[in-house]
C-alpha cells in the first residue's frame, strides 16, 4: 500500500526494564487503523543494523531481522488492530539494554517513538529469623540481582537509625556468572518490632518486611521498577 496523505500519527512508548533470563515487554501503542493489512510495525535498536522485529500485512516479516534477536521477538498479533505494537522479548539478555524505536506506518500516516530499555536482574527478598545464630538475628535473602545493589536495613521502632554497624551483607555470584545472590544479616534484633530489608540498584527497588512479636512472625515483600512509568 502507499501513504497518500502526509499526516503523522501518534505513537506512545513507555520506558521499561527487563529481568535477564526472563521475558520482557517493550510497550508501544499507536492510533489504530481499520485494516490490519495497512499496518506496518518496525522495531529498531540504536547501534543494531538489522531490525529487531517487523510486522506487516498481518504477519511477521523477519527477513531483515538482526541475528541477536532471532527467535526471541513477537508482537501481540491479535492486538495490533486496536493499536498495540508492544514487543515481547524472550530470554532478555544484558546486551538488550539500549534505545529502541517503535516505528509505525498505517494508511493514516507514519509515526515513531523511542524508549529506553534497561536490563538487569531483580528479585523479591525474603526475610527470616535466623535461629542458628547465637543472638536474635534476621537474614534477608534475594536470589538474583544485577548490577550489584545496595542493602539498607530499617526498623519501625528505631526510625532513622543506621544499622550498617550491626549488619553484614554479602554478594555471591550465581552459576551463570552475571547475577548475584544477595544475603544480608542483621544482628541484635528486638522483638515487637518491624524490620525492613531494602535492596536497590538503578533498575529496581525491593523491600522485604518482617514483623516479629512474641506470638507470631509476619512477612511481606514488594518490588518496584525504577525510572519506569508502568
Amino acid at each position: 500500500f502507499g501513504i497518500s496523505g502526509r499526516h503523522s500519527i501518534t505513537v506512545t512508548t513507555v520506558a521499561s526494564a527487563g529481568n535477564i533470563g526472563e521475558d520482557g515487554i517493550l510497550s508501544c501503542t499507536f492510533e489504530p487503523d481499520i485494516k490490519l493489512s495497512d499496518i506496518v510495525i518496525q522495531w529498531l535498536k540504536e547501534g543494531v543494523l538489522g531490525l529487531v522485529h517487523e510486522f506487516k500485512e498481518g504477519k511477521d516479516e523477519l527477513s531483515e531481522q538482526d541475528e541477536m534477536f532471532r527467535g526471541r521477538t513477537a508482537v501481540f498479533a491479535d492486538q495490533v488492530i486496536v493499536g498495540n505494537a508492544s514487543l515481547r522479548l524472550k530470554n532478555v539478555q544484558l546486551t538488550d539494554a539500549g534505545t529502541y524505536k517503535c516505528y509505525i506506518i498505517t494508511s493514516k500516516g507514519k509515526g515513531n517513538a523511542n524508549l529506553e530499555y534497561k536490563t538487569g536482574a531483580f528479585s523479591m527478598p525474603e526475610v527470616n529469623v535466623d535461629y542458628n545464630a547465637s543472638s536474635e538475628t534476621l537474614r534477608c535473602e534475594a536470589p538474583r540481582w544485577f548490577p550489584q545493589p545496595t542493602v539498607v536495613w530499617a526498623s519501625q521502632v528505631d526510625q532513622g537509625a543506621n544499622f550498617s554497624e550491626v549488619s553484614n551483607t554479602s554478594f555471591e555470584l550465581n552459576s551463570e556468572n552475571v547475577t548475584m545472590k544477595v544475603v544480608s544479616v542483621l544482628y541484635n534484633v528486638t522483638i515487637n518490632n518491624t524490620y525492613s530489608c531494602m535492596i536497590e540498584n538503578d533498575i529496581a527497588k525491593a523491600t522485604g518486611d518482617i514483623k516479629v512479636t512474641e506470638s507470631e512472625i509476619k512477612r511481606r515483600s514488594h518490588l518496584q521498577l525504577l525510572n519506569s512509568k508502568a
Partner: antibody
Amino acid sequence: EVQLVESGGGVVQPGRSLRLSCAASGFTFGDRAMNWVRQAPGKGLEWVSAISSSGTTSYYADSVKGRFTISRDNSKNTLYLQMNSLRAEDTAVYYCARKRWYGMDVWGQGTTVTVSS
Amino acid sequence: SYELTQPPSVSVAPGKTARITCGGNNIGSKSVHWYQQKPGQAPVLVVYDDSDRPSGIPERFSGSNSGNTATLTISRVEAGDEADYYCQVWDRGMIFGTGTKLTVL
C-alpha cells in the same frame, strides 16, 4: 563536541591495499553503529559499508563486497576500513559517518584516496 | 535495488522558496533524510525522519514525504543555501539520491 576524524588516505597503485581510520570523540562510540560513505570526484554520495555498535554485524555495498572490510575497536574509539584489491573507480573522498536510526547525523571531514598507476 | 531520483539542478531567487524532490517507489512508507553539502565540505544533515530538523538547522528547512515523492523545502532562500542536496533512505544499506545542485540566482 561530537567529532569524527578520518585518516589513512593517500595515493596507491591498482591492486594494492590501504587502511582508513576514523577517530571518534565526544560521544559513547560503543553505543552507535557507524558507516563509511565515499564520493568520487564530481560525483554524488555512495554508501560503502556499515557496522553495528558491537562490531558483530556488517553490511557492504555490492561494489566493494569481498574487497573491503569494515571493523572497529571500541576500546580505542576507532572505526576502520581495510581496502584490498583497489581499483581506479575506488578513487574518492571517504567519509565516516555515525548512524542514527535510518540516517546519519554526524560526518567526518573526509580523507582522499587516489588509486592510480 | 531501491533507487532515488532527484532533479540535477534547481534555481531560485533569493527570498523565494526552493523545492527539491526525491522520487522513489512508495517512498512515503520509508523514512527520508536530507543532507546539504557545500563545495569542499562534508555533508550536513538538515532534515531527518521526513520532516524533523536537527538542532542548529534553521526553521526555513522543512520536509515532507508521501506517495512516491519526498520533498525538501527551503523557504526565504539565502545565498548561503547554495549547495548540493541529497536525499537518503535505508534499505539494508544507505541509499542516496542522485543529488540536486541548488543555485541561488
